[in-house]
Amino acid sequence: NECPKLQPPVYGKIEPSQAVYSFKDQVLVSCDTGYKVLKDNGVMDTFQIECLKDGAWSNKIPTCKIVDCGAPAGLKHGLVTFSTRNNLTTYKSEIRYSCQQPYYKMLHNTTGVYTCSAHGTWTNEVLKRSLPTCLPVCGQPSRALPNLVKRIIGGRNAELGLFPWQALIVVEDTSRVPNDKWFGSGALLSESWILTAAHVLRSQRRDNTVIPVSKEHVTVYLGLHDVRDKSGAVNSSAARVILHPDFNIQNYNHDIALVQLQKPVPLGAHVMPICLPRPEPEGPAPHMLGLVAGWGISNPNVTVDEIILSGTRTLSDVLQYVKLPVVSHAECKASYESRSGNYSVTENMFCAGYYEGGKDTCLGDSGGAFVIFDEMSQHWVAQGLVSWGGPEECGSKQVYGVYTKVSNYVDWLWEEMNSPRAVRDLQVER
């Protein structure tokens, strides 16, 4: 009642290995690492057979089949390439995930290399079975920002792609008679979020209540250069409008807000996010130079009073930009305290501009980002938001522009963007 001698399968083994197998003896067939037992189209780790009374084995020896991890999953904003010839997906084959450069970058700077494991899963040394994440690259325009800027008063035309984070925010309140329409700027933080000033998105009421405009009345344009030609721009409606809860209409303290876009915008050469600063209380240091862009008033001969009285919303057709130095808090406070009127330069604000005037941001530039190049990270960072200025015409001597100090609000911004009320996919590479 002996059973015939067994031949182990290729890439496999039989245990126990005996010279003779008798009735009721059992053997376990297993495969080498990276191979699985294949029996009747079923895949298993081991297979047991038994020597029967009649001297035959209960089953034929199965074969060992190489583990196949299958086609790798697609990566949002990324692609996968095969490192192994013939696009093999079997055990020990390698693939590499990469992100759509230069607009996306891999989180944690992982290699993106995955190997087909013995368990049949694509595995990375660091991320294990999780896929990498492609985050938008922030603060790195595809076109290098220029070093020298001549005298949005005293500014110059921006070339397309210089400020890929720049957003035009148009608010049209059709519920009012006559229709109320105004605009401001904003800065793209991720595919779904726009950073701006709260006063741009506050419903223009006659009393001092702070109520956000209805999201239905907000349109955001990205990748826009000339407001007369919106054909190349991406326009998006708002899913949510969030004003800072402490925004004070009296003194413009906490003048910061977010717009969540209805759907994520595709990133490209003309649409890229700006970086947020590190959360630190000091903000940008005096004399640091920043750039700010906008479609606001660029005619130095027109006073703000004239514009308000005439009721027109004069704006530049082509995006303008200007380079301005940060002014010390003490100097700015002093310059406003010497004026009639109840001006308050709080610790949530900083100032920028020239003592002699000539260059400034102006009406219509509100909400735009004051960006500074961070030498350490080699990214442009939104340190400020165009907020307010004195009563004199823009660019007047010793009237500095006042900006919201963004570094004081990084915790609030992240909390809002990651709150359960918000859509996911919000991280940005720093």
Epitope: F247, N253, E280, E282, W412, E415
Partner: antibody, heavy 120, light 107 residues
Framework: QVQLKQSGAELVKPGASVKMSCKAS????????IEWMKQNHGKSLEWIGN????????KYNEKFKGKATLTVEKSSSTVYLELSRLPSADSAIYYC?????????????WGQGTLVTVSS | DIVMTQSQKFMSTSVGDRVNVTCKAS??????VAWYQQKPGQSPKALIY???YRYSGVPDRFTGSGSGTDFTLTISNVHSEDLAEYFC?????????FGSGTKLEIK
């Protein structure tokens, strides 16, 4: 999670000084200022001042200038409040607290308080 | 300094009632008011910030309203565990100041 652990109760003689501590954990210490409040028995709260570990900047309520001194030991994420020339009116519970948002000084996280008793 | 006045030192209420705790600022503080609850022998706990925003984990029976100088904390359906003292605080300008407190007593 954010935690503020304060030092134990103190019994001090009138005219003496006392130094109490507030040890922070569960967040990046240098991101938020530590605030200090005084609460007399059965009374309301008074804001003494705050200390920002990021740059060592401190702000004081005019009423407590010369009375309170705030210092830091960054290595242990601890802020200290020293009160000098104590009269019996300074017998109170002293709380340290942390803001929820850096720019908005309302206090989401509080220490358990340090009871200071000034008595001869 | 901005004075925060809580005119009612004590308020008596029954379980299930609705109660309004008021606070008045001596000058306009915009929306920058917070409300705290303090139970005997405990540290204060934040309930409301920015006049009307409920802090995380606070039951929705607590609501805040007001702006400028007049502020109200409403407890819509008083529970026995709401027996505590309630303080308002302005954080519009230095020095930050608190109201004198309102003690809620359950009948």
């Amino acid at each position: 999670q954010v935690q503020l652990k304060q030092s134990g109760a103190e019994l001090v003689k009138p005219g003496a000084s006392v130094k109490m501590s507030c040890k922070a954990s569960g967040y990046t210490f240098t991101t938020y200022p530590i605030e200090w409040m005084k609460q007399n028995h059965g009374k309301s709260l008074e804001w003494i001042g705050n200390f920002h570990p990021y740059n060592g900047d401190s702000k004081y309520n005019e009423k407590f200038k010369g009375k309170a001194t705030l210092t830091v030991e960054k290595s242990s994420s601890t802020v200290y409040l020293e009160l000098s020339r104590l009269p019996s009116a300074d017998s109170a519970i002293y709380y340290c607290a942390r803001r929820h948002y850096a720019a908005s000084p309302w206090f989401a996280h509080w220490g358990q308080g340090t009871l200071v008793t000034v008595s001869s | 300094d901005i004075v925060m006045t809580q005119s009612q030192k004590f308020m008596s209420t029954s379980v299930g009632d609705r109660v309004n705790v008021t606070c008045k600022a001596s000058q306009n503080v915009g929306p920058t008011v917070a409300w705290y609850q303090q139970k005997p022998g405990q540290s204060p706990k934040a309930l409301i910030y920015s006049a009307s925003y409920r802090y995380s984990g606070v039951p929705d029976r607590f609501t805040g309203s007001g702006s400028g100088t007049d502020f109200t904390l409403t407890i819509s359906n008083v529970h026995s565990e709401d027996l505590a003292e309630y303080f308002c605080q302005q954080y519009n300008s230095y020095p930050f100041t608190f109201g004198s407190g309102t003690k809620l007593e359950i009948k």
